[in-house]
Interface confidence: medium
Amino acid sequence: VPRWRQQWSGPGTTKRFPETVLARCVKYTEIHPEMRHVDCQSVWDAFKGAFISKHPCNITEEDYQPLMKLGTQTVPCNKILLWSRIKDLAHQFTQVQRDMFTLEDTLLGYLADDLTWCGEFNTSKINYQSCPDWRKDCSNNPVSVFWKTVSRRFAEAACDVVHVMLNGSRSKIFDKNSTFGSVEVHNLQPEKVQTLEAWVIHGGREDSRDLCQDPTIKELESIISKRNIQFSCKNIYRPDKFLQCVKNPEDSSCTSEI
């Protein structure tokens, strides 16, 4: 008789999840000399231990502590780039501007980027059929708790000027319910962080509006100011030109506004 299995609303664990995590870990440690000593088998064991045999709606930050310990990494605290709803451009930027880091440029972020995972209560099986959806099922699921944990730690580590890339094409440029709005903003440390600088990325070619005046940006400014952190905002009217100028800052066309 087939065992009854909980059906969740979200997609199941990514195919070949264990192999993917292990392979990504090995690749990361090969590329980043300061992390080359990390034992990827131990990392996978700790990752697995955070959610295997546990109810996928009852995961806590505590479950991920062994993994957090193994993935401890020092990134320059004044070179942190946060992002919200514009991951691809943020990653393209740090691929060019090699001394800046998004969360996904760290070991733990790199391991989990774009992956889904969950287990089942009291069995050692990984659930490849379905996993809890944050809205429809529960917020304390393995994926959401993981990103909340690593995002909090990443924000807590930031210092001096912290940059955040925001998507100017969205109806809510700053969304209080995003990971940035609900976790990272509230975990920047005022005693370490002097300024949060928002880069609002424009989508349309002819869009010359000052999106820094958007009501949601003003809301972000208010939240940040109340936390005794200065706020500044810049419009990035031409993201393609922006990236090009990061690559070739000497280009004569890069002196004008981008």
């Epitope: 090995v26 440690t29 090969e30 000399p33 300061e34 080359r36 000593h37 990390v38 034992d39 088998q41 131990s42 990392v43 310990k69 193994l70 401890t72």
Partner: antibody, heavy 119, light 110 residues
Framework: QVQLVESGGGLVQPGGSLRLSCAAS????????MNWVRQAPGKGLEWVSV???????YYADSVKGRFTVSRDNSKNTLYLQMNSLTAEDTAVYYC?????????????WGQGTTVTVSS | QSVLTQPHSASGTPGQRVTISCSGS????????VNWYQQLPGTAPRLLIY???KRPSGVPDRFSGSKSGTSASLAISGLQSEDEADYYC???????????FGTGTKLTVL
């Protein structure tokens, strides 16, 4: 063939300085992680410092601020500048290549050069 | 002082199997890979085991390594007289930001 040859050891007074050299052949020092490891008479191995292919350097607490690791890519040579030497620094000093990649053990060692700090 | 602890000495007769332990903490062995080095009398160390359990070419399969939690061990089966040497475990330590070697184990073949 792949080998490392240390030189520059000798007798030095406490408070003095010495510069050790490690000449590499068969591979480039700039493309690998290069370590210095020492062994005091009758004692075990003690890691001293490392220089990464990217140029980052790390040191054991016991030598931090006194020793400096560097390299000359044109000479394919690794150096260890040792200042403010004390009797505790008396040891055989080895340079060792740490293979760059997931396989990262120190797979090539020099024969060692002896440093004696004594008045 | 070393932060990786090994037995001071070990011994065995030819053909026997001998195991050398190496005990550390979560900041070194717990999260990082372990290497083992052999040092024959009067010579430089030689890499014996890397990444917990892998052998470089030229190292006989009589030598094997393993790791569990914050401890590691080196096993030598079919002991031979030429195995008489000092053996050191080593790992990177995240807290110290540097390598740590074990205290070393002197292996005697009786």
């Amino acid at each position: 063939q792949v080998q490392l040859v240390e030189s520059g050891g000798g007798l030095v007074q406490p408070g003095g300085s010495l510069r050790l050299s490690c000449a590499a052949s068969g591979f480039t020092v700039s493309g690998n992680y290069m370590n210095w490891v020492r062994q005091a008479p009758g004692k075990g191995l003690e890691w001293v410092s490392v220089i990464y292919s990217g140029g980052d350097t790390y040191y054991a607490d016991s030598v931090k601020g006194r020793f400096t690791v560097s390299r000359d890519n044109s000479k394919n040579t690794l150096y260890l500048q040792m200042n403010s030497l004390t009797a505790e620094d008396t040891a055989v000093y080895y340079c060792a290549r740490e293979y760059s990649g997931y396989y990262y053990g120190m797979d090539v060692w020099g024969q060692g050069t002896t440093v004696t700090v004594s008045s | 002082q070393s932060v990786l602890t090994q037995p001071h000495s070990a011994s065995g007769t030819p053909g026997q199997r001998v195991t050398i332990s190496c005990s550390g903490s979560s900041s070194n062995i717990g999260g990082n890979t372990v290497n083992w080095y052999q040092q024959l009398p009067g010579t430089a160390p030689r890499l014996l085991i890397y990444t917990n359990n892998k052998r470089p070419s030229g190292v006989p399969d009589r030598f094997s390594g393993s790791k569990s939690g914050t401890s590691a061990s080196l096993a030598i089966s079919g002991l031979q007289s030429e195995d008489e040497a000092d053996y050191y475990c080593a790992a990177w330590d995240n807290s110290l930001k540097g390598y740590v070697f074990g205290t070393g184990t002197k292996l005697t073949v009786l």
